[in-house]
Interface confidence: low
């Protein structure tokens, strides 16, 4: 359904409020360093133009593509060259190359100050003084720090952000009401951003086929009663939505996501019995709810998979006739029977099945060749099961902080070239798998743990891609999307690494550590731990534990001292000397 004016079409479909919010998100995700006021000005100009096109779709420039309109607008920014350097060269290109160029310059780790939360009264005053600007600023700050955040979902977060302030700024104890809500939104927002980043990496680095395979597996687990053709339709539509959002086409993405939610709710009888509550909600909540909906119950009468995919004499004929449809059916049938498997495991099984058919269908006796293919699945299933069992035992024994420390040591020894902040961030997130997943019963542990680890390891991959320092990281990140976690798990200590020179400054601490939150204090200690391992990669667990215990005692002692700064200076020197002796530095 071609429209004379794409911008008018999207404005009418989305409404002015969502249109403006999405254009702001798009601009902030592209030009991450631009001041808020500059973006608001650009958005207002685009909005006024869109209104002229709604009034008359034949008006000048209304027939231009959204990329052309938005790119032209971004290229009017006066300080583009000074602020963004070579990104300004994008403006010399024509569409679609210009948009591709902007996409390539998105920065997963922009050099922006940490968001500091003002006092509650200050925030409430700002909210009441100008609610619209306050909420726009939220969208802007999140979007520029998370250039791949799923835009329609960010609208949902903004709606919850507004609701929190509306409720809590009237409460007797504003802080008690507001702060837990803001913490929850922050944590959920980081998780949502990381999950979407994996989807975009999957599409951009491994292609549409990889994303579609992931979607077939996940939707088949979630909607096991749906027919294969129904799942295929949902996968096609979902792929379009995410391709658009990952490609910066946020208006189309939000519009198509709304259409998909509408379709799912109109057809829930042939999709899932779990959708009823979701489908009664307003649009943003509905889409979020559908994306998070629990798995439907498996049909009780599913026959054995072997009949169609192993015992049948026609396997090779069916495979040859339509490879991707046949493999899609295999993945669908396997996934709907295995909500207890991670998506990445299901994809490994499908890949093994595909490799076997490629080999066997060219053999003298294909059936004899592929007859035992299901036996090859056993070790693939057992590997993550055993790993999760061992790590959950370790988590239960150590607790989250010490479990994170164990992972910090493990990963620093595997890839010591990676920057310390990245190792700390990634290992802390890897360590959160314990509290997130180990509480679940066996049947839910693997999908929770391994699919979460895929998201976290993707963070490592995208951060490392910006400044590549380790061939081992590059190899694990680029060879196979579904084998990233096994690849990192299999890495041993990097024997080629030359230890870092000892620098006392790295281990010098000041009284400001005493005023930090518990989380910030942990990060300081974990940063020191990574640096220790980089200096002494062969240090034993016991040696590292002894040094870290001494360090914790030192911080506690000096934070209780009357003259904290003197304590940190004097006791710090002793601690460094003792640590050097303990580690043989």
């Amino acid at each position: 359904d071609a429209h004379k004016s794409e911008v008018a079409h999207r404005f009418k479909d989305l409404g002015e409020e969502n249109f403006k919010a999405l254009v702001l998100i798009a601009f902030a995700q592209y030009l991450q360093q631009c001041p808020f006021e500059d973006h608001v000005k650009l958005v207002n100009e685009v909005t006024e133009f869109a209104k002229t096109c709604v009034a008359d779709e034949s008006a000048e420039n209304c027939d231009k593509s959204l990329h052309t309109l938005f790119g032209d607008k971004l290229c009017t920014v006066a300080t583009l060259r000074e602020t963004y350097g070579e990104m300004a060269d994008c403006c010399a290109k024509q569409e679609p190359e210009r948009n591709e160029c902007f996409l390539q310059h998105k920065d997963d780790n922009p050099n922006l100050p940490r968001l500091v939360r003002p006092e509650v009264d200050v925030m409430c005053t700002a909210f009441h003084d100008n609610e619209e600007t306050f909420l726009k600023k939220y969208l802007y700050e999140i979007a520029r720090r998370h250039p791949y955040f799923y835009a329609p979902e960010l609208l949902f977060f903004a709606k919850r952000y507004k609701a929190a302030f509306t409720e809590c700024c009237q409460a007797a104890d504003k802080a008690a009401c507001l702060l837990p809500k803001l913490d929850e939104l922050r944590d959920e927002g980081k998780a949502s951003s990381a999950k979407q980043r994996l989807k975009c990496a999957s599409l951009q680095k491994f292609g549409e086929r990889a994303f579609k395979a992931w979607a077939v597996a996940r939707l088949s687990q979630r909607f096991p009663k749906a027919e294969f053709a129904e799942v295929s339709k949902l996968v096609t539509d979902l792929t379009k939505v995410h391709t658009e959002c990952c490609h910066g086409d946020l208006l189309e993405c939000a519009d198509d996501r709304a259409d998909l939610a509408k379709y799912i709710c109109e057809n829930q009888d042939s999709i899932s019995s779990k959708l009823k509550e979701c489908c009664e909600k307003p649009l943003l909540e509905k889409s979020h709810c559908i994306a998070e909906v629990e798995n439907d119950e498996m049909p009780a009468d599913l026959p054995s998979l072997a009949a169609d995919f192993v015992e049948s004499k026609d396997v090779c004929k069916n495979y040859a006739e339509a490879k991707d449809v046949f493999l899609g059916m295999f993945l669908y049938e396997y996934a709907r029977r295995h909500p207890d498997y991670s998506v990445v495991l299901l994809l490994r099984l499908a890949k093994t099945y595909e490799t076997t058919l490629e080999k066997c269908c060219a053999a003298a006796d294909p059936h004899e060749c592929y007859a035992k293919v299901f036996d090859e699945f056993k070790p693939l299933v057992e590997e993550p099961q055993n790993l999760i069992k061992q790590n959950c035992e370790l988590f239960e024994q150590l607790g989250e902080y010490k479990f994170q420390n164990a992972l910090l040591v493990r990963y620093t020894k595997k890839v010591p070239q990676v920057s310390t902040p990245t190792l700390v961030e990634v290992s802390r997130n890897l360590g959160k798998v314990g509290s997130k997943c180990c509480k679940h019963p066996e049947a839910k542990r693997m999908p929770c743990a391994e699919d979460y680890l895929s998201v976290v390891l993707n963070q490592l991959c995208v951060l490392h891609e910006k400044t590549p320092v380790s061939d081992r990281v590059t190899k694990c990140c680029t060879e196979s999307l579904v084998n990233r976690r096994p690849c990192f798990s299999a890495l041993e200590v990097d024997e080629t690494y030359v230890p870092k020179e000892f620098n006392a400054e790295t281990f010098t601490f000041h009284a400001d550590i005493c005023t930090l939150s518990e989380k910030e204090r942990q990060i300081k200690k974990q940063t020191a731990l990574v640096e220790l391992v980089k200096h002494k990669p062969k240090a034993t667990k016991e040696q590292l534990k002894a040094v870290m215990d001494d360090f914790a005692a030192f911080v506690e002692k000096c934070c209780k001292a009357d003259d904290k700064e003197t304590c940190f200076a004097e006791e710090g020197k002793k601690l460094v000397a003792a640590s050097q002796a303990a580690l043989g530095l």
Epitope: E227, D301, D308, D314, N318, E321, V325, E333
Partner: nanobody, 115 residues
């Protein structure tokens, strides 16, 4: 919306014949293999017959071989099952499905074979 609508069932005497039809909509019918599945009262579903997307390759359960014929007309988005020499044990609700899944999302059509 994916829809499968079966018709053609009814009461027939042993040795008689029936032709079932399944009208498909909401998906690219010609791209998918199709099957007939049946469920007798108080029993689980039983796969009956399958046909590939082009209609060249057909397969049958041992219990119906030589008596039933599956076919399709992709121009009409319709799947057929010609049932000859019907027996009382063929009494069941017959469903068409996509692929060879024995799960079902349609209403089915009742076939009763009785004297």
């Amino acid at each position: 919306e994916v829809q499968l609508l079966e018709s053609g069932g009814g009461l027939v005497q042993p040795g008689g014949s029936l032709r079932l039809s399944c009208a498909a909509s909401g998906f690219t019918f010609g791209s998918f293999g199709m099957s007939w599945v049946r469920q007798a009262p108080g029993k689980g579903p039983e796969w009956v017959s399958a046909i590939d997307s082009g209609g060249a390759d057909t397969r049958y359960a041992e219990s119906v071989k030589g008596r039933f014929t599956i076919s399709r007309d992709n121009s009409k988005n319709t799947l057929y099952l010609q049932m000859n020499s019907l027996r009382p044990e063929d009494t069941a609700v017959y469903y068409c499905t996509i692929g060879r899944s024995a799960s079902r999302s349609s209403q089915g059509t009742l076939v009763t074979v009785s004297s």
